[in-house]
């Protein structure tokens, strides 16, 4: 985790700062949303528990051609210890429900903000 944030700032950053950056990006996405995010693309809902970062990446990586979430995808890859490819579903998924990317981002943001407020950075 301490190696995160290289794309936003030089050198390693503390885990709290890395989580800050991800929250900031998700806030920006939700606040700057005018047209439907990613043209209303649907993604698998995930369990917001252990393995959440990899699960979130596995879900979002299947959305292509959506520049609004590219930075989020890169950030999540920094939180996930293994390489994630499109079509891969090895992490904890509730693979019975699909939701719009916009709702996915809102749900993820709420959960990450709670983790941040609790001081759970790892």
């Amino acid at each position: 985790l301490t190696c995160l944030g290289g794309f936003a700032s030089p050198g390693p950053v503390p885990p709290s700062t890395a989580l800050r950056e991800l929250i900031e990006e998700l806030v920006n996405i939700t606040q700057n949303q005018k047209a439907p995010l990613c043209n209303g693309s649907m993604v698998w809902s995930i369990n917001l528990t252990a393995g959440m970062y990899c699960a979130a990446l596995e879900s979002l990586i299947n959305v292509s051609g959506c520049s609004a979430i590219e930075k989020t995808q890169r950030m999540l890859s920094g939180f996930c210890p293994h390489k994630v490819s499109a079509g891969q579903f090895s992490s904890l998924h509730v693979r019975d429900t699909k939701i719009e990317v916009a709702q996915f981002v809102k749900d993820l943001l709420l959960h990450l903000k709670k983790l941040f407020r609790e001081g759970q950075f790892n």
Epitope: S9, P14, T17, R20, I23, V27, F116, R117, E118
Partner: antibody, heavy 123, light 107 residues
Framework: EVTLRESGPGLVKPTQTLTLTCTLY??????????VDWIRQPPGKGLEWLAH???????RYNPALKSRLTISKDTSKNQVVLKLTSVDPVDTATYYC???????????????WGQGTLVTVSS | DIQMTQSPSSLSASVGDRVTISCRAS??????LNWYQQKPGKAPKLLIF???MKPRGVPSRFSGSGSGTDYTLTISSLQPEDIATYYC?????????FGGGTKVEIK
């Protein structure tokens, strides 16, 4: 209008437990994104953050005082209570409560403050 | 914990002067820097948050700037009612920490 009002004992003896109450007006701690912080200021000195509590009962403490501090809320009374155990004369200070909001980015900026309550620790 | 260092600890300036107060953090705080004004015998008041954003009602002569570890509060034209102690506070992550304060007086 948003107002916060602290109340406390004024004088506490060393080793006793200090209990401070912050009553909230004009906003509710049951509302999403609302939080309340406690800050203290010894006479003639600077500000020291003690603890905060969020609407969903998430709590954080100053590590230097964590073992002695407990923060809690009573949503029905719209109050936040701070307890500081085993007080010492160095805990003599004006104790403030303040509101913080976590909408959007979490700024941890305290936008409304109470007037403060002076607590003296002496035998 | 993130340490906050303010300078100067006190200053004396004339009415109408431009006043600057500096605040340095022990690590990059990503613009999560807040400024408070505390008048004698009163509670602190939020003056600037997130480096440069102002709550409603704060006079335009107050402004904030900075990034990374270094931040500045500027009073463009000092007024008699600005006599106070000014504190910076990092809001990156708890434990929230304050600078030692800068006492501003009128010459």
């Amino acid at each position: 209008e948003v107002t916060l009002r602290e109340s406390g004992p004024g004088l506490v003896k060393p080793t006793q437990t200090l209990t401070l109450t912050c009553t909230l007006y004009g906003f509710s701690l049951s509302t999403s994104d609302m939080g309340v912080d406690w800050i203290r200021q010894p006479p003639g000195k600077g500000l020291e953050w003690l603890a905060h509590i969020w609407w969903d009962d998430v709590k954080r403490y100053n590590p230097a005082l964590k073992s002695r501090l407990t923060i809690s809320k009573d949503t029905s009374k719209n109050q936040v209570v701070l307890k500081l155990t085993s007080v010492d004369p160095v805990d003599t200070a004006t104790y403030y409560c303040a509101r913080t909001v976590s909408s959007g980015y979490i700024y941890y900026a305290m936008d409304y403050w109470g007037q403060g309550t002076l607590v003296t620790v002496s035998s | 914990d993130i340490q906050m260092t303010q300078s100067p600890s006190s200053l004396s300036a004339s009415v109408g002067d431009r006043v600057t107060i500096s605040c340095r953090a022990s690590q990059d705080i990503r613009n999560y820097l807040n400024w408070y004004q505390q008048k004698p015998g009163k509670a602190p008041k939020l003056l600037i948050f997130y480096t440069s954003m102002k709550p409603r009602g704060v006079p335009s002569r107050f402004s904030g700037s900075g990034s990374g570890t270094d931040y500045t509060l500027t009073i463009s034209s000092l007024q008699p009612e600005d006599i106070a102690t000014y504190y910076c506070q990092q809001g990156l992550t708890p434990p929230l920490t304050f600078g030692g304060g800068t006492k501003v007086e009128i010459k």
